[in-house]
């Protein structure tokens, strides 16, 4: 038995460009906390697989409010260590996930809101009883600096916390068959009595009275080689008598790693690198159940209790992801129409509508053409939050109720005189100009700069604007 200890040193922007925005603001103060998840072996650190070695949550850090305009600094951290107790042996190799969570402390409806800021993961080899190991991990633009160690709880000692120690009976040496607990410790390994007759060379025990066999040996006392055949077997053991040189089976022969795991030989055993979703010494364990508490942020877990059945997290409003770990910025979907301002209140969305619009999403135009008529043959056109009338010729105003003076805008160029006409206006052009608006000069030789005037109209005649 023992304790894994994690000390967070700093959490802040990593080096390089693209510094992250501070997660807290004057409007929305927040504080950080951390979660660590440990798994045995060197399997993939799938965030979804359970924390078989244990997990721990830190205290909340100090409340932090961003200084306007300042870059995100290293954020204030919770006090103390994260401690993950382990009951059995320390595995020596382990995977970790460290999550940095933000707790928002603004005027939240229904309590504080949590969101995952960063998640780092890794695989490490660590002997219990060793010094603090320092590490730096990056997640996006964030950088996490931390140290960790594993220590045994007395009377357990050793790199796996499996040996029990007691003071030496003699000053210089331990009893027969016992070794020092560590080269410099003044204690000896306590004797562990295995099953009577258990092979001292090929068997061992972790509990009194048992006899567990080392690789290549079997039988109740571990005295029987797994392969007793001679060199006729392609994987048979070496035989000094026949001069056979075929090596015995390796630990990865036949691939002991299940579920597509890959095997590599270690100095005395083997190691499985497991595909995502599997873990365990041989990648034999799969699936996550609701018993593992995989849903964050108040998500409701639905699923069977057996390892083979999947689980589903039903997320509360404002959260998403397979584990409800992601805070949804629902305003990013721009749900408010017609330029309305979106407000995410956590429990609900609110749209603040511009003048002239209404409805939950500002979808209703208050000044639309419904029930409104444009007089004198005008047609109603919607747009911009207000209706307008496109008036028939000779009429104007908001509802086309006013008679228009077609000459008010002085449409005839070059001193031409304007006459109102029932079908519009007529320009009487000054000498030397022609065209519907008297816009074209007439050349001195009488030739027009344009194609000849329509039949029946001479230069200088009033031009009717149709």
């Amino acid at each position: 038995a023992g304790v894994f200890e994690l000390q967070i040193h700093s959490f802040g922007p990593g080096p390089g460009p693209g510094a992250p925005r501070s997660p807290c603001s004057a409007r929305l103060p927040c504080r950080l906390f951390f979660r660590v998840c440990l798994k045995p072996g060197l399997s993939e650190e799938a965030a979804e697989s359970p924390c078989a070695l244990g997990a721990a949550l830190s205290a909340r850090g100090p409340v932090y409010t961003e200084q306007p305009g300042a870059p995100a600094p290293d954020l204030p951290l919770p006090d103390g260590l994260l401690q993950v107790p382990f009951r059995d042996a320390w595995p020596g190799t382990f995977s970790f996930i460290i999550e940095t969570w933000r707790e928002e402390l603004g005027d939240q409806i229904g309590g504080p809101a949590w969101s995952l800021l960063a998640r780092v993961a890794g695989r490490r080899r660590l002997a219990a009883g060793g010094p603090w190991a320092r590490d730096i991990q990056r997640a996006g633009a964030w950088e996490l600096r931390f140290s960790y160690r594993a220590r045994c709880e007395p009377p357990a000692v050793g790199t796996a916390c499996t040996r029990l120690c007691r003071p030496r009976s003699a000053p210089s040496r331990c009893g027969p068959g016992l070794r020092p607990c560590a080269p410099l410790e003044d204690e000896c390994e306590a004797p562990l009595v295995c099953r009577a007759g258990c092979s001292p060379e090929h068997g061992f025990c972790e509990q009194p009275g048992e006899c567990r066999c080392l690789e290549g040996w079997t039988g109740p006392l571990c005295t029987v080689p797994v392969s007793t055949s001679s060199c006729l077997s392609p994987r048979g053991p070496s035989s000094a008598t026949t001069g056979c040189l075929v090596p015995g089976p390796g630990p990865c022969d036949g691939n002991p790693c299940a579920n597509g795991g890959s095997c590599s030989e270690t100095p005395r055993s083997f190691e499985c690198t497991c595909p995502r979703g599997f873990y365990g010494l041989r990648c034999e364990v799969s699936g996550v159940t609701c018993a593992d508490g995989p849903c964050f942020n108040g998500g409701l877990c639905v699923g069977g209790a057996d390892p083979d059945s999947a689980y589903i997290c039903h997320c509360p409003p404002g959260f998403q992801g397979s584990n409800c770990e992601k805070r949804v910025d629902r305003c990013s979907l721009q749900p408010c129409r017609n330029g309305g301002l979106c407000l995410d209140l956590g429990h609900a969305l609110r749209c603040r509508c511009r003048a002239g619009f209404a409805g939950p999403r500002c979808e209703h135009d208050l000044d639309d053409c419904a029930g409104r008529a444009c007089a004198n043959g005008g047609t109603c056109v919607e747009g911009g939050g207000a209706h307008r009338c496109s008036c028939a010729l000779g009429f104007g105003g908001r509802d086309c109720r006013e008679r228009a003076d077609p000459c008010a805008a002085r449409p005839c160029a070059h001193g031409g005189r304007c006459y109102a006409h029932f079908s519009g206006l007529v320009c009487a052009c000054a000498p030397g100009y022609m065209g519907a608006r008297c816009e074209f000069p007439v050349h001195p030789d009488g030739a027009s700069a344009l194609p000849a005037a329509p039949p029946g109209l001479r230069p200088g005649d009033p031009q009717r604007y149709l």
Partner: antibody
């Protein structure tokens, strides 16, 4: 005092089998946590691990040479024997044996004592 | 296979200098082991389990690192330190050594 000494032929012909013996004193391969390994070093080149054997007869071989290597121990004689078949001139090297210690099930603590080495030349 | 890359491959320094040799593994190895070898001699263990000094090794030698990047430091070079240094990993088979760093007198 812990010592290790390699012995075997200094010259072997191509295709022949090399048998090297490591004789050690000051520790026993019947003691839990003890192992003996073989390492070689071609002239002017880096070290290359070949194989090792533990007190409980767990063995490891370099994958690239596995089909040619066999390691055995004789606990009563304090000896470890390495056999390498089908020798080739590229196998010319100084061959070392060394003690390996593991105070944990699968973590090597140290390869702390080495023999003086024996130069093996492969030539016809 | 885990490749071990030492840098520099060779290094000239003077007595009293502080020297750093790095070893980079192609994948995480967690522990590193360092050896010193002089011409015509067997390698000698210097550092085991990354930072532990082997018996009889002077305290001017130190080891550090984690994951894939490890360092051997000699705080103040002595005449007897001029040799070739090797790193090694015991994580997975084959248990590979670095190509060596030759430390020479400037």
């Amino acid at each position: 005092q812990i010592t290790l000494k390699e012995s075997g032929p200094t010259l072997v012909k191509p295709t022949q089998t090399l048998t090297l013996t490591c004789t050690f004193s000051g520790f026993s391969l019947s003691t839990s946590g003890m192992g003996v390994g073989w390492i070689r070093q071609p002239p002017g080149k880096a070290l290359e691990w070949l194989a090792h054997i533990w007190w409980d007869d767990v063995k490891r071989y370099s994958p690239s040479l596995k089909s040619r290597l066999t390691i055995t121990k004789d606990t009563s004689k304090n000896q470890v024997v390495l056999t390498m078949t089908n020798m080739d001139p590229v196998d010319t090297a100084t061959y070392y044996c060394a003690r390996i210690v593991s105070f944990d099930n699968d973590v090597v603590s140290a390869m702390d004592y080495w023999g003086q080495g024996t130069l093996v030349t492969v030539s016809s | 296979d885990i490749q071990m890359t030492q840098s520099p491959s060779s290094l000239s320094a003077s007595v009293g200098d502080r020297v750093t040799i790095t070893c980079s593994a192609s994948s995480s190895v967690s522990y590193m082991y360092w050896y010193q070898q002089k011409p015509g001699k067997a390698p000698k263990l210097l550092i085991y389990l990354t930072h532990n000094l082997a018996s009889g090794v002077p305290s001017r030698f130190s080891g550090s690192g984690s994951g894939t990047d490890f360092t051997l430091t000699i705080s103040s070079l002595q005449p007897e330190d001029f040799a070739t240094y090797y790193c090694q990993q015991w994580r997975s088979n084959p248990f590979t050594f670095g190509q060596g760093t030759k430390l020479e007198i400037k």
